[in-house]
């Protein structure tokens, strides 16, 4: 067989046997010659350089460019190829010889006792067992151990060339420890060298740093990094690392493999880092490196060495927070630090402590924002070690958009009787206040009568085409009276009127309201009615138990069928239609009630009367009455407020309190309820009774002692009480000094 | 700067041994692994050997295993490449290139081994 | 071992056209982790390989932005858009998802 290019000049050198395979008994002596144009020379197998006593490589006798190569008793370890090629150049002829030695079959490598095969455990892959034979057809299996196992030649994937070795899938032998090939010549089994089977991986699949970041310690303490790298199974890992002062005499390295679960496909290698007395000149870029051989990674953090423990504000950290109401608000504590600082949030001095609404950590986050979360917010951070605190004032405060009072009253509103003067209002609670409150109106049939658009919970009133108030042409003259600010339950509120001179005609009115935050707005049906009217009896809000009549008056002579009837809860209708009040056109959602008519000259009055009201009987009443000419209904409807029943409390500032003889003693109790309480004062639990010293005032509510003696002296109690019980708040009342005696002075006396 | 400088290329016999020595500087040579390439006379690159930072680990080509160790000196900031056994298909430009990630980022200009009688 | 072909082995270009180089490989590059394992290098004449790109995708640094790698599991591409005089030389793949890593036989690209 020839080897290389071919040259211009140079034919191949020729071998004295012209044959690709040679195949010789052991034993016998092997001599080849080899002729060729210019300097030539002799591989020959094993021993790959001129160094081998047995072989002799001798010039020719009979020409120039002509050398023999000869070996005496050869031996199956002889079995191979020989090379015969020109100096310098690619140009060789090779002849492969099988030297057959059936004691020994397989060729040994000189030097090893043992041989080694790397593998991967990779499905895909091969490996060659160099057992290479001294005979071309043998029968050869491969043994694995241990566990025992025999691998037979399958004419696929498992193969045995004399020339190469026994190649199989290398995962099949990735268990094994050791593995030798065996052949058999006339039932006697022969075997190769021992192969040491060294399953090797590579491939680190990351290299992780704890802790990985915002490392930060002060002079003195104690550095601990764990590097630790994850590798496919079968890996070695050498580590290093590199970090500012490198020669430290204080470090300690410690490298070990992780446990894994069995099962795992993964390795765990750590390398630790320990720095004890870390010193300033050690802050810095701290890497970390895993390397395998043919894969490195590295990982790198950054170590910050303080002089000493300190806390103190970040610039970023902010003063005034604004937020909307049922917002998240996150007020983060923006702190630079070491160690990390306790962190405590105060509210208007008070601590505030974590619940389902507010998180109290390193972020204040409180869930939903209402007006009773504005304040002055105050974070205490403390340093940990050493002691030192730090405090900053936040300011929240919450914007409400707009919100109108009346807007809760969601039923059909009263109707208004015709001709009469009206006064409609919004009632708008916001903050900042609204910087306006417009009025628009529409007439009622413009706006209930448009079957094409559909109606929504949030918008019942789908009307488009609302006009100004300052344009009232085709509708009732309409003055606005100027914003008015009052403080309602508590809060400062602007209250805007709207002032209808004449209710001549059906309309929608809706006040709108904007502020910096957002708008709101409140639409009235007012619905003007030229049919009865009702009245309420006593006219005042009836409370739970009281008794209360609703009285419909109506002119005899244009008025027949006067009926009461109940508005029931309705599901809001469908179509725009039906809206907003017309119920007359909607008799299902009534409910007929039983009554009683009057009749006096000119009218007729029919009373439905309510004894004992609960809070079932608020609600919408509808007076129906027909129209005797034309057999038109006429409706008006008055809604019922039920007043619940409530026990009487008490506020007021009656405490403990010491006053000199002769002067006054001045304290109020104020009480609240439904039916509202009667007030009563007792000293030393017996009634006290106004005369020239003690004045009781404002329904009892005010309690005035003038000159007090030293008799006056006592426990004083206020008690309120009504049909649901009492109430009582109690005070001592110590007198200091001495009584002056003189008869100008007519004193009162209790009892 | 990265550098790598390859030296003690030649021409020697088959049979013979050469000690190739890459010199690196610019970086911190204890935190990467080596590796030596190499490309025969209008060849592809052929990947040699390779060695983990620490030295520990080495991986070699069917083709040189056995004959050839990749070794480095850490205090000297060097790599290392005995070749044993040289045989003519040894002869190529041997390159050695820095390796983070298994990928070769830098590599040296080369030195050229001869094997020839 | 992983065979790696590449096509064309010689590409003559003029100074601002866009070219492609493709890469096969025997084995699918595409790791259990979810990477493929394939690199680009240039080697421009006289000098040593230049990492070009890594990851099958990702440009090393200092590499210009003509320069894109995109593939499968076993066909590559690196495509050079807008091609430079400084572009010349050889361009090879190098697969590293399993050992020995190969490289490919090598394009040579050259100005027409």
């Known amino acids: 067989a020839s080897v290389g290019l071919p040259s211009v000049s140079l034919d191949l050198p020729r071998l004295s046997i012209q044959k690709d395979i040679l195949t010789i008994k052991a034993n016998t002596t092997l001599q080849i010659t080899c002729r060729g144009q210019r300097d030539l020379d002799w591989l020959w197998p094993n021993n790959q350089s001129g160094s081998e006593q047995r072989v002799e490589v001798t010039e020719c006798s009979d020409g120039l460019f002509c050398k023999t190569l000869t070996i005496p008793k050869v031996i199956g370890n002889d079995t191979g190829a020989y090379k015969c090629f020109y100096r310098e150049t690619d140009l060789a002829s090779v002849i492969y010889v099988y030297v057959q030695d059936y004691r020994s079959p397989f060729i040994a490598s000189v030097s090893d006792q043992h041989g080694v095969v790397y593998i991967t455990e990779n499905k895909n892959k091969t490996v060659v067992i160099p057992c290479l034979g001294s005979i071309s057809n043998l029968n050869v299996s491969l043994c694995a151990r241990y566990p025992e196992k025999r691998f037979v030649p399958d004419g696929n994937r498992i193969s045995w060339d004399s020339k190469k070795g026994f190649t199989i899938p290398s995962y099949m032998i990735s268990y094994a420890g050791m593995v030798f090939c065996e052949a058999k010549i006339n039932d006697e089994s022969y075997q190769s060298i021992m192969y040491i089977v060294v399953v090797v991986g590579y491939r680190i699949y990351d290299v992780v740093l704890s802790p990985s970041h915002g490392i930060e310690l002060s002079v003195g303490e104690k550095l601990v990094l764990n590097c630790t790298a994850r590798t496919e199974l079968n890996v070695g890992i050498d580590f290093n690392w590199e970090y500012p002062s490198s020669k430290h005499q204080h470090k300690k390295l410690v490298n070990r493999d992780l446990k894994t679960q069995s099962g795992s496909e993964m390795k765990k290698f750590l390398s630790t880092l320990t720095i004890d007395g870390i010193t300033r000149s050690d802050q810095g870029l701290y890497t970390c490196a895993a390397s395998s051989g043919l894969m490195t990674k590295k990982n790198s953090t950054f170590v910050r060495v303080h002089e000493k423990p300190f806390v103190a504000f970040g610039s970023g950290m902010e003063s005034l927070v604004e937020a909307t109401v049922g917002e998240r608000v996150r007020i983060p504590a923006k702190y630079l630090g070491y160690p990390p600082p306790e962190i405590k949030w105060y509210k208007n001095g008070i601590p505030l402590e974590s619940n389902h609404t507010i998180k109290a950590g390193h972020v204040l986050t409180i869930m939903e924002v209402s007006e009773r979360d504005t304040g002055n917010y105050t974070v205490i951070l403390t340093n940990p070690i050493s002691k030192e605190k730090q405090s900053h004032v936040v300011s929240l405060v919450v914007y409400v958009p707009p919100q109108i009072g009346e807007k809760s009253l969601i039923s059909p509103v009263d109707s208004y009787q015709y001709g009469t003067t009206q006064t409609l209002t919004c009632t708008v609670y916001a903050i900042p206040p609204p910087h306006h409150i417009h009025w628009y109106w529409q007439l009622e049939e413009e706006c209930a009568n448009e079957p094409s658009h559909a109606v929504s919970v949030t918008n019942p009133y789908p009307c488009e085409e609302w006009r100004s108030v300052e344009d009232f042409q085709g509708g009732n003259k309409i003055e606005v009276n100027k914003n008015q600010f009052a403080l309602i339950e508590g809060k400062n509120k602007t209250v805007s009127t709207l002032v209808i001179q004449a209710a001549n005609v059906s309309a929608l009115y809706k006040c709108e309201a904007v502020n910096k935050v957002g708008r709101g707005e409140r639409v009235i049906s007012f619905h003007v009615t030229r049919g009865p009217e009702i009245t309420l009896q006593p006219d005042m809000q009836p409370t739970e138990q009281e008794s209360v009549s609703l009285w419909c008056t109506a002119d005899r002579s244009t008025f027949e069928n006067l009926t009461w009837y109940k508005l029931g809860p309705q599901p809001l209708p469908i179509h725009v239609g039906e809206l907003p009040t017309p119920v007359c056109k909607n008799l299902d959602t009534l409910w007929k009630l039983n009554a009683t008519m009057f009749s006096n000259s000119t009218n007729d009055i029919l009373i439905m009367e309510l004894k004992n009201a609960s809070l079932q009987d608020q609600g919408d009443y509808v007076c129906l009455a027909q129209d005797r000419k034309t057999k038109k209904r006429h409706c008006v409807v008055r809604q019922l407020t039920v007043l619940e029943r409530v026990a009487p409390t008490i506020t007021g500032n009656l405490e403990n309190q010491t006053t000199s003889i002769g002067e006054s003693i001045e304290v109020s109790c104020t009480a609240s309820g439904n039916p509202p309480p009667q007030i009563m004062w007792f000293k030393d639990n017996e009634t006290l009774v106004e005369d020239s010293g003690i004045v009781l005032k404002d329904g009892n509510r005010n309690l005035t002692i003038r000159r007090v003696r030293k008799e006056d002296e006592g426990l004083y109690t206020c008690q309120a009480c009504s049909v649901l019980g009492c109430a009582k708040v109690e005070a001592f009342f110590i007198i200091e000094g001495a009584q002056e005696k003189t008869n100008l002075e007519h004193h009162h006396h209790h009892h | 700067e990265v550098q790598l400088v390859e030296s003690g290329g030649g021409l020697v016999k088959p049979g013979g041994s050469l000690r190739l020595s890459c010199a690196a500087s610019?970086?911190?040579?204890?935190?990467?692994?080596m590796s030596w390439v190499r490309q025969a006379p209008g060849k592809r690159l052929e990947w040699v050997a390779s060695i983990s930072i620490g030295g520990s680990y080495t991986y070699y080509a069917d083709s040189v295993k056995g004959r050839f160790t990749i070794s480095r000196d850490n205090a000297k900031n060097t790599l290392y490449l005995q070749m044993n056994s040289l045989r003519a298909e040894d002869t190529a430009v041997y390159y050695c290139?820095?390796?983070?990630?298994?990928?070769?980022?830098?590599w040296g200009q080369g030195t050229t081994l001869t094997v020839s009688s | 071992d992983i065979v790696i072909t590449q096509t064309p082995l010689s590409l003559p270009v003029t100074p601002g056209e866009s070219v492609s180089i493709s890469c096969r490989s025997s084995?699918?590059?595409?790791?259990?982790?979810?990477?493929?394992?394939l690199n680009w290098f240039l080697q421009r004449p006289g000098q040593s390989p230049q990492l070009l790109i890594y990851l099958m995708s990702t440009r090393a640094s200092g590499v210009p932005d003509r320069f894109s790698g995109s593939g499968s599991g076993t066909d590559f591409t690196l495509k050079i858009s807008r091609v430079e005089a400084e572009d010349v030389g050889v361009y090879y793949c190098?697969?590293?998802?399993?050992?020995?890593?190969?490289f490919g036989s090598g394009t040579k690209l050259e100005i027409k």
């Open positions: 290139a820095r390796e983070l990630d298994g990928n070769y980022d830098y």
């Open positions: 190098q697969q590293l998802v399993e050992y020995p890593f190969t």
């Open positions: 084995k699918s590059l595409l790791y259990k982790d979810g990477k493929t394992y």
């Open positions: 610019g970086f911190t040579f204890s935190m990467y692994g």
